[in-house]
Interface confidence: low
C-alpha cells in the first residue's frame, strides 16, 4: 500500500530513508536535456523475497536531441518547482539497515539522472530526520517518521524534532550540548510523490540525533 502523502515537514530539517521497503518505487527521472529511452522503465521497484531484496528495472536516459516519442507520464524535474528538493550527493550504503529483510539499499546512480530522486513510499517505511547545515537539534532522542495505516488511511507519525540556528539557541532553556548535523530538505505536506536526496548520514546518526516537540499534523 502506497503512502498517500509525504513525510512530515520539519522546519530546517531534512529526511532520509536508510533502506527502502519492498514495494517502494523510484521514478526514472532524467536531468535537463535528457529523457527516458523509448523502451525504458518509468520507475524502479524494490522487490524480493524473504532472503533478498533488490531494485527491479533499470532507469536509462538518452539525449532529448534524439527523436523519442515516449509519453512522459511523470513530470520532468523542471516542472517540479513546487516540490522542495535538495541536490543529489554521492550515494551512500548505510551498513546498519541496508541488510534488513524486505528492504532495498539506496539505488545506484544511473547515467544522466535528475538531480533529485522522487520516491513513492509504502506503509511501514521509516525515514530519519536531521537538521540542515547551520542549524542544530535540541535534545537527544529518535527523530524518525513511519508511514502507518490507520482506519484505512495512511499517515506518517510525527518526528519529535526542532532545529534551531546558532543565533537562536539562547532562547531555549535547558538544552543539551548538541553535535553538528548535515544537509537539508524543505517542504510539502500534501503531495503523493516524495523527493529526497542522498545526503551523508553517519551510521551513528540515531545516537547523535537530538530532538524536541512540535508537530505539524495529526497522526
Amino acid at each position: 500500500e502506497l503512502c498517500d502523502d509525504d513525510p512530515p515537514e520539519i522546519p530546517h530539517a531534512t529526511f532520509k530513508a536508510m533502506a527502502y521497503k519492498e514495494g517502494t518505487m523510484l521514478n526514472c527521472e532524467c536531468k535537463r536535456g535528457f529523457r527516458r529511452i523509448k523502451s525504458g522503465s518509468l520507475y524502479m521497484l524494490c522487490t524480493g523475497n524473504s532472503s533478498h531484496s533488490s531494485w527491479d528495472n533499470q532507469c536509462q536516459c538518452t539525449s532529448s536531441a534524439t527523436r523519442n516519442t515516449t509519453k512522459q507520464v511523470t513530470p520532468q524535474p523542471e516542472e517540479q518547482k513546487e516540490r522542495k528538493t535538495t541536490e543529489m550527493q554521492s550515494p551512500m550504503q548505510p551498513v546498519d539497515q541496508a541488510s534488513l529483510p524486505g528492504h532495498c539499499r539506496e539505488p545506484p546512480p544511473w547515467e544522466n539522472e535528475a538531480t533529485e530522486r522522487i520516491y513513492h513510499f509504502v506503509v511501514g517505511q521509516m525515514v530519519y530526520y536531521q537538521c540542515v547545515q547551520g542549524y542544530r537539534a535540541l535534545h537527544r532522542g529518535p527523530a524518525e517518521s513511519v508511514c502507518k495505516m490507520t482506519h484505512g488511511k495512511t499517515r506518517w507519525t510525527q518526528p519529535q524534532l526542532i532545529c534551531t540556528g546558532e543565533m537562536e539557541t539562547s532562547q531555549f532553556p535547558g538544552e543539551e550540548k548538541p553535535q553538528a548535523s548535515p544537509e537539508g530538505r524543505p517542504e510539502s505536506e500534501t503531495s503523493c510523490l516524495v523527493t529526497t536526496t542522498d545526503f551523508q548520514i553517519q551510521t551513528e546518526m540515531a545516537a547523535t540525533m537530538e530532538t524536541s516537540i512540535f508537530t505539524t499534523e495529526y497522526q
Partner: antibody
C-alpha cells in the same frame, strides 16, 4: 472526535498561583506534543508553552519563563499549566492545543483574570 | 522574534466578494505559515497550513499563497458564515508568532 476541555481558571489576585488543566479525549494523547496558547481580552494570540509527547522537553516564551510550568500526565490524558507569581498581564483566555506549532485542535479555552 | 504584520486590520465586504488578507513576516519564514479563523466567542480553527494546504473539512473557497516574507489568505466568494477574525502564524522559528488579526465583517 477530538475533545480538549480546559478547567481551573477564574479570578485570582496578583502574586498568587493557579493550575490549569486540559482533559483530552478522542485521540492518542501520549503520541502528541501539546501546547498552551493565550489570548488577552480583545487582543491577539500568543503561544505560551509547549511540551513534547513524552513530557521530557518543554519550551516557554520569554515573558513567562520561570513562572509558568507546563506538564502532562499521559496516563490520565491530561495537560497542565502551573502559573506562579501571577501578573495583571497574564489575564487572558488560555487555550489547550494539540499538534504543536500547527494548533491543529483547540479547546474552548478557560478565562484567567488577575486582579486585586 | 519574527513579527507577523497583518493587513488590513479591519475589512468590510459583501457576500460573493473576493477577499484577500495579507501577512508580512519580518524575515523569511520559508512558507511555514498557518492561517486561522476565529469566530466571536469561539476558539480559533486552522484553515490553511504550510502556506497553501487546505485543512480537512475547510471549504475550498479558502486558499493560501505566498513565499519568503509575504503571504496571503484568499476567500474566493465571501459567505455570511465567514464573518470572523483571521490570524496568520509562522512556525519557521521559535517562538512561533501570530499576526495581529484581521476582523472581517459584512457590508
Amino acid at each position: 472526535e477530538v475533545q480538549l476541555v480546559e478547567s481551573g481558571g477564574g479570578l485570582v489576585q496578583p502574586g498568587r498561583s493557579m493550575k490549569l488543566s486540559c482533559a483530552a479525549s478522542g485521540f492518542t494523547f501520549s503520541n502528541h506534543a501539546m501546547a498552551w496558547v493565550r489570548q488577552a481580552p480583545k487582543k491577539g494570540l500568543e503561544w505560551v508553552a509547549y511540551i513534547s509527547y513524552d513530557g521530557d522537553n518543554t519550551y516557554y516564551r520569554d515573558s513567562v519563563k520561570g513562572r509558568f510550568t507546563i506538564s502532562r500526565d499521559n496516563a490520565k490524558s491530561t495537560l497542565y499549566l502551573q502559573i506562579d507569581s501571577l501578573r495583571s498581564e497574564d489575564t487572558a483566555t488560555y487555550y489547550c492545543t494539540t499538534g504543536g506549532n500547527s494548533g491543529y485542535d483547540w479547546g474552548q479555552g478557560v478565562m484567567v483574570t488577575v486582579s486585586s | 522574534d519574527i513579527q507577523m504584520t497583518q493587513s488590513p486590520s479591519f475589512l468590510s465586504a459583501s457576500v460573493g466578494d473576493r477577499v484577500t488578507i495579507n501577512c508580512k513576516a519580518s524575515q523569511n519564514v520559508n512558507k511555514f505559515v498557518n492561517w486561522y479563523q476565529q469566530k466571536l466567542g469561539e476558539a480559533p480553527r486552522r484553515l490553511i497550513y504550510g502556506t497553501n494546504s487546505l485543512q480537512t473539512g475547510i471549504p475550498s473557497r479558502f486558499s493560501g499563497s505566498g513565499s519568503g516574507t509575504d503571504y496571503t489568505l484568499t476567500i474566493s466568494s465571501l459567505q455570511p458564515e465567514d464573518v470572523a477574525t483571521y490570524f496568520c502564524q509562522q512556525y519557521s522559528s521559535w517562538p512561533w508568532t501570530f499576526g495581529g488579526g484581521t476582523k472581517l465583517e459584512l457590508k
